[in-house]
């Protein structure tokens, strides 16, 4: 078995880091491989083990518990196949952050012909990401997802107001949201579960 290139790792920066790696042939990840990891810079750090699973026949993924990381944490990692080391390297959870996807996306009717979208960011106030996340809201026609609007929410509050009449009346729309860190390097989260609603408003007389 050979590892192709470097494993790709990211962290949710609260409890879990995930590594994925590609192999040169089909493998049963959980029976043939294991990933050892430990906090660096301290000789007495506990050695931890992650048993990978297949995400494809030649791709393994491991979810490692890294509870409440801090910026300067770094883990030494070693991938083993029985008694042979396939790869070793290090990973900093703060160096590649993929935040938890937001949840509880909700549409509220607002005053003055506006919709209000709200959602929950899943980080507690003592986490670096609590005040840091920016959001992207995608609103698309349910019957034609290629017709969409994107709102970049660069303020901290998990909410977005937009005019009802920016969307067509008499059409079903779907919204979803994702987040990323401004101050830590990384990628967008997965999209939140989407919500769908029927957009209806009375056209002005002149447009009827």
């Amino acid at each position: 078995i050979k590892v192709l290139g470097e494993p790709t790792c990211f962290s949710d920066y609260i409890r879990t880091s995930t590594c994925e790696w590609f192999l040169d042939s089909a493998v049963d990840c959980s029976s043939q491989l294991c990933l050892h990891y430990r906090l660096m810079f301290f000789e007495f750090s506990e050695n931890l083990t992650c048993i990978p699973r297949n995400s494809a026949s030649t791709v393994c993924v491991c979810h490692m518990e890294m509870n409440r990381p801090v910026q300067s944490d770094r883990y030494q990692m070693e991938l083993w196949a029985e008694h042979r080391q396939l790869w070793q390297g290090s990973f900093s959870p703060s160096g590649n952050v993929k935040p938890l996807a937001p949840d509880n996306l909700t549409l509220h009717t607002n005053v003055s012909d506006e919709w209000l979208l709200t959602w929950n960011n899943l980080y507690p106030s003592n986490n670096l990401l609590y005040k840091d996340l920016i959001s992207m809201v995608n609103i698309s026609r349910e019957d034609n997802p290629a017709e969409f609007i994107v709102y970049n929410v660069t303020y901290k509050e998990p909410r977005l107001s937009f005019p009802i009449n920016i969307l067509m009346s008499g059409v079903y729309y779907t919204a979803r949201v994702r987040v990323r860190s401004q101050i830590l390097t990384g990628t967008w989260s997965e999209w939140s579960p989407s919500i769908t609603w029927y957009n209806h408003f009375q056209l002005p007389l002149i447009q009827r």
């Epitope: 906090l39 810079f41 301290f42 801090v70 770094r74 290090s90 003592n126």
Partner: antibody, heavy 117, light 111 residues
């Protein structure tokens, strides 16, 4: 013996920038984080940020983001901190320190920065 | 940010007696089976010096007169017996949460 030798005192004008150095010896420079800490006169200590010399990964205290920039030169085992747009609030002693498991086991000699017109 | 409250702000202890310094964190600093609380000594004109790491581990070269204890939010540095060379300011430091923070210091005077 593990040592961190810092550059000498700096007297700078308000609005200017300053760059100080921290030269490591007695250990493998790329194996440990280097942290920077501020101590204002007669005050406690404030963490500024860290850098991992092996690949340049770094992180900052939100308070010092935009104020401090951390870099390293692996070939000379030296870490650098640049402070910009200096004001009298930046007058302090600045320490580099080697990071272990979320603590600082060896401290530099300190660089005194005085901001005055 | 986690706030560390040290007490007392200063104390005077007779040579050969015991000195006890307290550090209280605004929230728990325990994680991974460790307490991420550490203690430093600083003398005038010198950098801080690590004494105790991970709440109770004595740094190499530090006299056994120094000891640390505690978990979660309440920690103690004890010097017993105190020597003349121990006159200094002592700081606690946590790093269970970004950013790492320090206590305001306790100044120890030897009588």
């Amino acid at each position: 013996e593990v040592q961190l030798q810092q550059s000498g005192p700096e007297l700078v004008k308000p609005g200017a920038s300053v760059r100080m150095s921290c030269k490591a010896s007695g250990y493998t420079f790329t194996d440990y984080n280097i942290h920077w800490v501020k101590q204002s006169h007669g005050k406690s200590l404030e963490w500024i940020g860290y850098i991992y010399p092996n690949n340049g990964d770094n992180g900052y205290n939100q308070k010092f983001r935009g104020k401090a920039t951390l870099t390293v030169d692996k070939s000379s085992s030296t870490a650098y901190m640049e402070l910009r747009s200096l004001t009298s609030d930046d007058s302090a002693v600045y320490y580099c320190a080697r990071g272990r498991l979320r603590y600082f086991d060896v401290w530099g000699t300190g660089t005194t920065v005085t901001v005055s017109s | 940010n986690i706030v560390l409250t040290q007490s007392p702000a200063s104390l005077a202890v007779s040579l050969g007696q015991r000195a006890t310094i307290s550090c209280r964190a605004s929230e728990s600093v325990d994680n991974y089976g460790h307490s991420f609380m550490h203690w430093y000594q600083q003398k005038p004109g010198q950098p801080p010096k690590l004494l105790i790491y991970l709440a109770s581990n004595l740094e190499s070269g530090v006299p056994a007169r120094f000891s640390g204890s505690g978990s979660r939010t309440d920690f103690t540095l004890t010097l017993d017996p105190v020597e003349a060379d121990d006159a200094a300011t002592y700081y606690c430091q946590q790093y269970n949460e970004d950013p790492p923070t320090f206590g305001s210091g306790t100044k120890l005077e030897i009588k």
